[in-house]
Amino acid sequence: SITGISPITEYLASLSTYNDQSITFALEDESYEIYVEDLKKDEKKDKVLLSYYESQHPSNESGDGVDGKMLMVTLSPTKDFWLHANNKEHSVELHKCEKPLPDQAFFVLHNMHSNCVSFECKTDPGVFIGVKDNHLALIKVDSSENLCTENILFKLSET
């Protein structure tokens, strides 16, 4: 369970892939589309508000007691819209919704590199936001070795 309804911190950053492609958001026909693309030089990067929440680890076998905490994040590129995991379609979508946000909007934060992060679905452990065919998709990761797979690694930048 998430230990507080308020985030412990928030962070406005641009999101890019391991290979430095930008994650961009475009309003089309009253809904937002998410793209993974190379930006032209000096083109402004879209920003995402990452809200960090503390959560107890769900496993009772962890042996951590109250100290087995994880960081969960929600990602909002624009007011009232949040990234959602659509596990049925293996897709990542932007949905307009009110707080409290549904579990599909929460992602467990990992960083297997000091300068890269990964986002694991709260609703589907072992499934991560990744890049597939120039779009964001949900990608199943079978083992901890595969957590370093480039297509689930993202960079956060203030610029």
Epitope: I8, G63, G68, M112, H113
Partner: antibody, heavy 121, light 106 residues
């Protein structure tokens, strides 16, 4: 209860080697970033090395890069620091520390009591 | 590499005083900053993480603030057990400690 117990410190001559160990218990060791931090006598804290939960990535400051190697054995719940080409300025108490959260490199939530390394001829 | 400049390096204060310690980063570290307390002969202890979040069990007289490059640790009413050395620590880009602030009895 989370416990981190360092061992392996002692007196070593300049140019010599030493291997420090940290025995971890009370938590899922394989899910956490781990660290070594040192403190020279009467001085402040200095980060020495970091390692990812799976051991696949390691990080060092310039002061120890190429001389020190951090590693871990998740099956044994153990963290190690191999120190080679030791210098007088490496004399310090060496602490083992655990990340505050599962999977992320943010904050040093738990610390061992430290082991003293003295480099002197 | 990010440098963390902590000030003052030492201060003398009395029980009940309000104490403020500052930490300045050489570049933007967002809110990726902790404060640690260390007593002589003991391991450091996490006090505050992500700039302003109190670690479990830490008294509410401790508070943290700041963002970007400038950060502050405040002890609202110094208690006898608070005489110790305090360190800031950034983890936005690599890992760096500040030089420490020793809080002594006046």
């Amino acid at each position: 209860e989370v416990q981190l117990v360092e061992s392996g410190g002692g007196l070593v001559q300049p140019g010599g080697s030493l291997r420090l160990s940290c025995a971890a218990s009370g938590f899922t060791f394989s899910s956490y970033w781990m660290y070594w931090v040192r403190q020279a006598p009467g001085k402040g804290l200095e980060w020495v090395a970091s390692i990812t939960p799976d051991g696949g990535n390691t990080y060092y400051p310039d002061s120890v890069k190429g001389r020190f190697t951090i590693s871990r054995d998740n099956a044994k719940n153990s963290l190690y620091l191999q120190m080679n080409s030791l210098r007088a300025e490496d004399t310090a108490v060496y602490y083992c520390a655990r990340g505050h959260y599962y999977y992320t490199s943010y904050s040093l939530g738990y610390w061992g009591q430290g082991t003293l390394v003295t480099v002197s001829s | 590499d990010i440098q963390m400049t902590q000030s003052p390096s030492s201060l003398s204060a009395s029980v009940g005083d309000r104490v403020t310690i500052t930490c300045k980063a050489s570049q933007n570290i967002n809110k990726h900053l902790d404060w640690y307390q260390q007593k002589p002969g003991k391991a450091p202890k996490l006090l505050i993480y992500f700039t302003n979040n109190l670690q479990t069990g830490v008294p509410s007289r401790f508070s943290g603030s700041g963002s970007g490059t400038d950060f502050t640790l405040t002890i609202s009413s110094l208690q006898p057990e608070d005489f110790a050395t305090y360190y800031c620590f950034q983890y936005n880009n690599g890992w760096t400690f500040g030089g420490g602030t020793k809080v002594e009895i006046k």
